[in-house]
Interface confidence: medium
């Protein structure tokens, strides 16, 4: 995947060069203000009928350096009695995210954009029953 | 989140320039190979006991330009009979993501990294009953 400028507002920008090492003004901006970083983790992971655990995925050479990845606790869902319901499955909801990776030993700092697929939480779905022909 | 305009892990880097011009390789690397981009949208949004809809959030000056945001279809969860269960709530699972925003009219191209909080899907949780004192 590549980020192609929508317009050619910049003259003489060759596409093949543009994507390699563009000098960009990399300002980091939080569109939700401090609200994002300070937001408390929700308790949905314990209260859900398809509960999950969070595992720390840590890489000091990446931004964000700490990413929490969800894993469903059970293959089945938990019913109102707290028992596993064998007609219902816990499934992982995944999200594709962008991360910045620092190119090793680079001064001035050089970053590359990477895509990652991370588990965010779990949801409960009815099992699909395969009918014999 | 906070940015402080001073520093230097790289020698001879003037504080004021530090965040100004860093190189970013704007080719987007898939850390999970083709698995990420080619993955089929799942049908969990319809099969879940807490179904959701996806709304298109589009911005041509952003990468990714299209982000699909989830919204829970109902306040309650759907039971095995397809009826809404008033003891169970559908709740939105949110994820903080990074996006690249192009600064308008910028030459050379200037991007800023923004954080966004997006809804990814819904899960079903037991309603919290508030007890009267």
């Amino acid at each position: 995947a590549a980020i192609i400028p929508q317009s050619s507002a910049c003259p003489n920008t060759e596409a093949k060069d543009f994507l390699q090492n563009v000098k960009v003004n990399l300002k980091v901006f939080n569109s939700l203000g401090a609200k994002v970083s300070s937001r408390r983790p929700s308790d949905y992971l314990n209260r859900s009928t398809s509960p999950w655990t969070l595992h720390r995925n840590e890489d000091p050479d990446r931004y964000p350096s700490v990413i929490w990845e969800a894993q469903c606790r059970h293959q089945r869902c938990v019913n109102a009695e707290g028992k596993l319901d064998h007609h219902m499955n816990s499934v992982l909801i995944q999200q594709e995210i962008l991360v910045l990776k620092r190119e090793p030993e680079s001064c001035p700092f050089t970053f590359r954009v990477e895509k990652m697929l991370v588990g965010v939480g779990c949801t409960c779905v009815a099992s699909i029953v395969r009918q014999a022909a | 989140a906070a940015i402080i305009p001073q520093s230097s892990a790289c020698p001879n880097t003037e504080a004021k320039d530090f965040l100004q011009n860093v190189k970013v390789n704007l080719k987007v690397f898939n850390s999970l190979g083709a698995k990420v981009s080619s993955r089929r949208p799942s049908d969990y949004l319809n099969r879940s006991t807490s179904p959701w809809t996806l709304h298109r959030n589009e911005d041509p000056d952003r990468y990714p330009s299209v982000i699909w945001e989830a919204q829970c279809r109902h306040q309650r969860c759907v039971n095995a009979e397809g009826k809404l269960d008033h003891h169970m709530n559908s709740v939105l699972i949110q994820q903080e993501i990074l996006v690249l925003k192009r600064e308008p009219e910028s030459c050379p191209f200037t991007f800023r990294v923004e954080k966004m909080l997006v809804g990814v899907g819904c899960t079903c949780v037991a309603s919290i009953v508030r007890q009267a004192a």
Partner: nanobody, 119 residues
Framework: EVQLVESGGGLVQPGGSLRLSCAAS????????MYWVRQAPGKGLEWVAK????????YYADSVKGRFTISRDNAKKSLYLQMNSLRAEDTAVYYC????????????WGQGTLVTVSS
């Protein structure tokens, strides 16, 4: 959950000394550069000092060079700031912050500890 807890602030006379501490948890402390930053009353955040993950290099803002010393103990997951020859203009809330690959960009910092320099 990443947590940073500062301590050691207080009221001190000009020319006096204080030692700030920061206890870290929820991440691999020894893998990250760490910072002290401060915010004087009515002012913006100001970078004070940085120490690399292994303690091999330190960096200081010009305003504190020669007076402040940053150090760390990776075994104890702790960061320190020894402040000598304190001046009235050092009065601020001091925060420790976890470094990221983005220069001087912080997602995580503590609740802060107030240092007041006054006679």
């Amino acid at each position: 959950e990443v947590q940073l807890v500062e301590s050691g602030g207080g009221l001190v006379q000009p020319g006096g000394s204080l030692r700030l501490s920061c206890a870290a948890s929820g991440f691999t402390f020894s893998s990250y550069g760490m910072y002290w930053v401060r915010q004087a009353p009515g002012k913006g955040l100001e970078w004070v000092a940085k120490i690399e993950q292994d303690g091999s290099e330190e960096y200081y803002a010009d305003s504190v060079k020669g007076r402040f010393t940053i150090s760390r103990d990776n075994a104890k997951k702790s960061l320190y700031l020894q402040m000598n020859s304190l001046r009235a203009e050092d009065t601020a809330v001091y925060y420790c912050a976890k470094g990221e690959i983005l220069p001087l960009y912080f997602d995580y910092w503590g609740q802060g500890t107030l240092v007041t320099v006054s006679s």
